[in-house]
């Protein structure tokens, strides 16, 4: 289904076995440290009311939040994966820098705000949960933006 032309990532970004593997390994390691299995950040509530053509823009917001407010504060943990995955995700973020939507993004901002509030409310364990869902972030970015 169509996306804003600037809200697009080349599929080749997701076809690099080494960094894909490292992203999933980082997620797996963090999820082992996540003791709050009742909450899912990247799930139905995040996308509710967001049309297919706006899903990449939403994922851009989630990616930027994850980089700035989750991965950077936790950058000394989960090595060596973290030091390899952060530059990769930063590259994806840069590629989406000109991704905007023309219509009203109020619902998107509401959904992203809810995710941010959940992470903040959980404190450090919220950050660990977000890292543990990097596999879902990766796949959702791919599905929404390619």
């Amino acid at each position: 289904l169509p996306v804003n032309t600037r809200c697009k990532l080349e599929v080749s970004n997701f076809q690099q076995p080494y960094i894909v593997n490292r992203t999933f390994m980082l997620a797996k390691e963090a999820s082992l440290a996540d003791n709050n299995t009742d909450v899912r950040l990247i799930g139905e509530k995040l996308f509710r009311g967001v049309s297919a053509k706006d899903q990449c823009y939403l994922m851009k917001q989630v990616l930027n939040f994850t980089l700035e407010d989750v991965l950077l504060p936790q950058s000394d943990r989960f090595q060596p994966y973290m030091q390899e995955v952060v530059p990769f995700l930063t590259k994806l973020s840069n590629q989406l820098s000109s991704c905007h939507i023309s219509g009203d993004d109020q619902n998107i901002q509401k959904n992203v705000r809810r995710l941010k509030e959940t992470v903040k409310k959980l404190g450090e364990s919220g950050e660990i949960k977000a890292i543990g869902e990097l596999d879902l972030l990766f796949m959702s970015l791919r599905n929404a933006c390619v």
């Epitope: 289904l1 599929v11 297919a52 929404a144």
Partner: antibody, heavy 116, light 112 residues
């Protein structure tokens, strides 16, 4: 949260038929909806989808043969010119995007028989 | 369009036993695979998505695994109520929307 199809009946080839999917417990402004069909004794076949913003997309084989539209609480599937090959149970389902599309819940289906 | 090839029907096992159903995709679909259960006269019911995530209310006896092109649904501690046809379903993104959703041909499970 539930969906239910209606409008299935016996029709003669070439007679247009509209099926209706009525939703309750959720809003069509929050979820896309899909139509899937199943011929007797056969597997599942995706027909098309109507997105939250009203955009419609169809399987390549279904283009021109089906039209999907909606109101605030219903989603219609029009079979423009039925043939005997369109005899099937027609299902509608809610599309929950969770980073990948998943279909849940489904309606019980409505049977369309095309015969002269 | 992606083609999904499932284990041939029927697959049978005794009550308390285990069955394994395979689903092979003709191209890499990452983990964009779901499994549905359909009993005669009923609509499909979502069991698993993201290849391995259990849908709400589905017993842990159902287990999905795999990624890329090879996927498996395993049902352990079989119950009579598990007798049904199981379908895998793929989502393919980035191509034209007219081939986005594909179902496998289905695998019938018989519980003896």
């Amino acid at each position: 949260q539930s969906v239910e199809e209606s409008g299935g009946r016996l029709v003669t080839p070439g007679t247009p038929l509209t099926l209706t999917c009525t939703v309750s417990g959720f809003s069509l402004s929050s979820y896309a909806m899909i139509w899937v069909r199943q011929a007797p004794g056969e597997g599942l076949e995706w027909i098309g989808i109507i997105d939250i913003d009203g955009s419609t997309y169809y399987a390549s084989w279904a283009k021109g043969r089906f039209t999907i539209s909606r109101t605030s609480t219903t989603v219609d599937l029009k079979i423009t010119s039925p043939t005997t090959g369109d005899t099937a149970t027609y299902f509608c389902a809610r599309d929950r995007f969770v980073g990948v599309d998943i279909f849940d819940p489904w309606g019980p289906g409505t049977l369309v028989t095309v015969s002269s | 369009a992606v083609v999904l090839t499932q284990t041939a029907s029927p697959v049978s096992a005794p009550v308390g036993g285990t069955v394994t159903i395979k689903c092979q995709a003709s191209e890499d679909i990452y983990t964009n695979l779901a499994w549905y259960q359909q009993k005669p006269g009923q609509p499909p019911k979502l069991l698993i998505y993201w290849a391995s995530t259990l849908a709400s209310g589905v017993p842990s006896r159902f287990k999905g695994s795999g990624s890329g092109t090879e996927f498996t649904l395993t049902i352990s501690d079989l119950e009579c109520a598990d007798a049904a046809t199981y379908y895998c379903q793929a989502c393919v993104y980035g191509n034209s929307a007219d081939s986005r959703y594909t179902f496998g041909g289905g695998t019938e499970v018989v519980v003896k």
